[in-house]
């Protein structure tokens, strides 16, 4: 059937529309287009004869129509009057006519709308505002947007006048937003510029900042007032009811106790005519004195004396605070505070109690700190140390020994050789030594304040021959895969080379072996059972060499997963069952057995005579090494067959 499709159906003024013909018959003579719903010669727009491939304009032709050879009609520069029906009259070669009617609607291109308002400055909680979208346009739909969102659902929002008017009842400050209206018709949609609603509100109750109400004499008072308000509020300050100034900030330098009182901020909105006030009470305190610390013992002796530190001056109704090393007081049974916290007592002082100590006085506003105090704790001398640590020297070298002992005040030193006083110095120097300089070298340290003395003795050997070295170990029974062992070759000797052998071989290359301390120390990391070997160290210099006796490393390991023998698991009734359990372990492990989960005997061998099918089950061997603290086990299934059957033996 011949049909007409309008593309588009809704046409904007000034645009174009195509009346598209569907199902055009074959064998045509020509066709004509008419304005309206019927064929009317006076309303012919255009005709087209296929034989001449030529169009002829009719009385209703406006110059804006173009006919296509497929009978479709294009109308350009559409005007409002083009709205309506169009009829195509098709003349077939057999002179039988066919007609079809199509239609389209013409709508104006909408202008950009604008918003008018009945109240440019509405007052919060009092006024209503009506926005109207201009101009009024027929066949147009009106939409509203608030902050580019569609209208929220609210009982205070009402649309009227065909949605052209948006009324906001009882406006609030939250209605201060961007409002846009949009006009739509089938061919266009236009949005207005945004209108910002200027809601007058406030002032709200002002806030005074800072919130601080306590001040010290001599400080500056700087108060700021703010109240939410549109337009911005005008501010006034009152002190104890007396007007001061019309500013948002109140500044009083160098305040005194006399500036204590009630401070009122008044906020005024000239447009709404409303006033709101807020009052804050300011208290000004006199400046307290700076505290200081007194001590009952300026030179206490370590582990003997107690010290009492007192925070001065004594002030009633005052909180005292203490700090040690810039930290609050640690919890310690040796630290005691008096009831009022003013006195801190250190019981049995140690050298670590030197401080510094500070006390503080808390007032309403802040804490005043004392200057730091450092305790002069007398201690020592500790056992002196003689360096260097060498005990063996070759003839002809210089002997230079130094002594040091921790002490306050610093220790006084004396040297004795074989019990004879040599000199009162911290260092002892003997040049070009011989075998005769071998002997006992004693350093004596004396603390004159405490009267205490301590001595250390060192044996010095002067010999051309090196002594036979020995190996010391930091761990005589290391555990496999857990411990490290450090072997050290003794003695420490000057200008000496240290060497190591394992099982008579030079050291293997291994990431687990590390030499240090001038090769004097050999460390084995993460020892294994394979490290249980003979270790020998050697020392040599240009004239002699010597080796230590071997030291065998006793590595604790295991127990490994045990093995039950024999491997058989099938037995004939009446046979003897003799199971032996073995696990690699150092020291040897303790063995125990369980049959079907029931503990049996603590032996390495389990023997059961003349077994029967009742002895079927699981046989578990448990091993434990008390030295390594490790355990292991294995389970074996035993099957006992009645006599006469011959089960295949299986391992």
């Amino acid at each position: 059937k011949l049909t007409i499709e309008s593309t588009p159906f809704n046409v904007a003024e000034g645009k174009e529309v195509l009346l598209l013909v569907h199902n055009l018959p074959q064998h045509l003579f020509g066709y004509s287009w008419y304005k309206g719903e019927r064929v009317d010669g006076n309303r012919q727009i255009i005709g087209y004869v296929i034989g001449t491939q030529q169009a002829t304009p009719g009385p209703a032709y406006s110059g804006r129509e173009i006919i296509y050879p497929n009978a479709s009609l294009l109308i350009q520069n559409i005007i409002q009057n083009d709205t309506g029906f169009y009829t195509l009259h098709v003349i077939k070669s057999d002179l039988v006519n066919e007609e079809a009617t199509g239609q389209f609607r013409v709508y104006p291109e909408l202008p950009k709308p604008s918003i008018s308002s009945n109240n440019s400055k509405p007052v919060e909680d009092k006024d209503a505002v009506a926005f109207t979208c201009e101009p009024e346009t027929q066949d147009a739909t009106y939409l509203w947007w608030v902050n580019n969102q569609s209208l929220p659902v609210s009982p205070r929002l009402q649309l009227s006048n065909g949605n052209r008017t948006l009324t906001l009842f009882n406006v609030t400050r939250n209605d201060t937003a961007s409002y846009k209206c949009e006009t739509q018709n089938p061919v266009s949609a236009r949005r207005s510029d945004s209108v910002i609603l200027n809601v007058l509100y406030g002032p709200d109750a002002p806030t005074i900042s800072p919130l601080n109400t306590s001040y010290r004499s001599g400080e500056n008072l700087n108060l700021s007032c703010h109240a939410a308000s549109n337009p911005p509020a005008q501010y006034s300050w009152f002190v104890n009811g007396t007007f001061q100034q019309s500013t948002q900030e109140l500044f009083i330098p160098n305040i005194t106790v006399n500036n204590s009182g009630s401070y009122t901020c008044q906020a005024h909105n000239s447009d709404t005519g409303l006033n709101r006030t807020t009052v804050t009470t300011i208290t000004v305190y006199a400046e307290p004195p700076k505290p200081f610390i007194t001590s009952n013992n300026s030179n206490p002796v370590e582990d003997e004396d107690a010290v009492a530190l007192t925070c001065e001056p004594e002030i009633q109704n005052t909180t005292y605070l203490w700090w040690v090393n810039n930290q609050s007081l640690p919890v310690s049974p040796r630290l005691q505070l008096s009831n009022d916290n003013r006195t801190l007592t250190l019981l049995s002082v140690t050298r670590n109690d030197v401080g510094p100590y500070e006390c503080g006085i808390q007032n309403k506003l802040s804490v005043d700190h004392s200057d730091p105090v450092i305790l002069n704790v007398l201690y020592g001398p500790d056992d002196p140390t003689i360096s260097p640590s060498y005990t063996y020297y070759r003839p002809g070298v210089n002997l230079s020994l130094s002594c040091h002992a921790a002490s306050n005040p610093p220790a006084q030193y004396s040297w004795l050789i074989d019990g004879n006083i040599q000199q009162h110095t911290q260092e002892l120097f003997i040049s070009n030594i011989t075998e005769k300089n071998s002997g006992l070298y004693t350093c004596q340290a004396n603390n004159s304040a405490s009267g205490h003395s301590r001595t250390t003795v060192k044996t010095i050997t002067v010999s051309a021959e090196l002594p036979k070295p020995s190996i010391s170990s930091n761990n005589s029974k290391p555990v496999e895969d857990k411990d490290a062992v450090a072997f050290t070759c003794e003695p420490e000797a000057q200008n000496t080379t240290y060497l190591w052998w394992v099982n008579g071989q030079s050291l293997p290359v291994s990431p687990r072996l590390q030499l240090s301390n001038g090769n004097r120390t050999l460390t084995l990391f993460n020892v294994t059972r394979n490290d249980a070997r003979a270790y020998v160290c050697g020392i040599q210099n240009s004239v002699s060499a010597n080796r230590s006796d071997p030291v065998t490393l006793d590595v604790l390991y295991g127990p490994d997963t045990p093995i039950i023998s024999p491997p058989d698991s099938s037995y004939l009734s009446g046979a003897n069952l003799n199971l032996s359990c073995h696990s690699a372990s150092n020291p040897s492990p303790q063995y125990s057995w369980r049959i079907n989960g029931i503990p049996q005997q603590h032996t390495q061998v389990l023997f059961i005579a003349k077994i029967t099918p009742n002895n079927n089950g699981t046989y578990a061997c448990f091993v434990s090494n008390l030295a390594t603290g490790r355990n292991n086990s294995i389970v074996k299934s035993i099957t006992v067959s009645a006599s006469g059957t011959s089960p295949g033996l299986s391992a």
Epitope: G41, Y48, Q54, P57
Partner: antibody
Framework: QVQLVQSGSELKKPGASVKVSCKAS????????VNWVRQAPGQGLEWMGW????????TYVQGFTGRFVFSLDTSVTTAYLHISSLKAEDTAVYFC???????????WGQGTLVTVSS | DIVMTQSPDSLAVSLGERATINCKSS????????????LAWYQQRPGQPPKLLIY???TRESGVPDRFSGSGSGTDFTLTISSLQAEDVAVYYC?????????FGGGTKVEIK
């Protein structure tokens, strides 16, 4: 854009035949008729007739019957003018022209000069 | 056949001056059904094919400068060039497309004086 491109100049002897082609592009070939116009040297324009590109039906003006044939190959959007038994008086520029929707010739080929000389 | 007669045969006009060409048909080319005059004007510059200027006696083809205008009644028609330009030097033909066969006028040659 709409273009009509004609074949090149021809020099023929009397009694011979010539075939002038007119290749159309830039529009739907079968929607617009193709006209043929002759312009003898120094003379005016003379309409020879046209061919309906939709039906293939030719129309010849009196004086251009018999020796003159209009044809089409719509697969290559080309119209042809075939002149047989050429005479000296057939010497002219032959134009093809598209018949506009209203009738007048809205687009023309560049012309083909056919010279008949012994 | 409808005979189309143009006058003058040639015309010399100064640059910027008006040029007027006349065309007369031997019978009316007015179609009473739509009140249209079935007459066209063409311009042929030297060595080029003709170019459609005017149809329906007075409707300018798209892209044609507005200094070209056409007018006329049932049998008498005029092509006017309001201000002659150098590129307007050409031969101008009128043509009727009212009745088969369509016929051209003899042409008017326009030159610059």
């Amino acid at each position: 854009q709409v273009q009509l491109v004609q074949s090149g100049s021809e020099l023929k002897k009397p009694g011979a035949s010539v075939k002038v082609s007119c290749k159309a592009s830039g529009y739907t070939f079968t929607n617009y008729g193709v006209n043929w116009v002759r312009q003898a040297p120094g003379q005016g324009l003379e309409w020879m007739g046209w061919i309906n590109t939709n039906t293939g039906n030719p129309t010849y003006v009196q004086g251009f019957t018999g020796r003159f044939v209009f044809s089409l190959d719509t697969s290559v959007t080309t119209a042809y003018l075939h002149i047989s038994s050429l005479k000296a008086e057939d010497t002219a520029v032959y134009f093809c022209a598209r018949k506009g929707i209203w009738g007048p010739f809205d687009h023309w080929g560049q012309g083909t000069l056919v010279t008949v000389s012994s | 056949d409808i005979v189309m007669t143009q006058s003058p045969d040639s015309l010399a006009v100064s640059l910027g001056e008006r040029a007027t060409i006349n065309c007369k048909s031997s019978q009316s080319v007015l179609y009473s059904s739509n009140n249209r005059l079935y007459l066209a004007w063409y311009q042929q510059r030297p060595g080029q094919p003709p170019k459609l200027l005017i149809y329906w006696a007075s409707t300018r083809e798209s892209g044609v400068p507005d200094r070209f205008s056409g007018s006329g009644s049932g049998t008498d028609f005029t092509l006017t060039i309001s201000s002659l330009q150098a590129e307007d030097v050409a031969v101008y033909y009128c043509q009727q497309y009212y009745s088969n066969p369509w016929t051209f006028g003899g042409g008017t040659k326009v030159e610059i004086k």
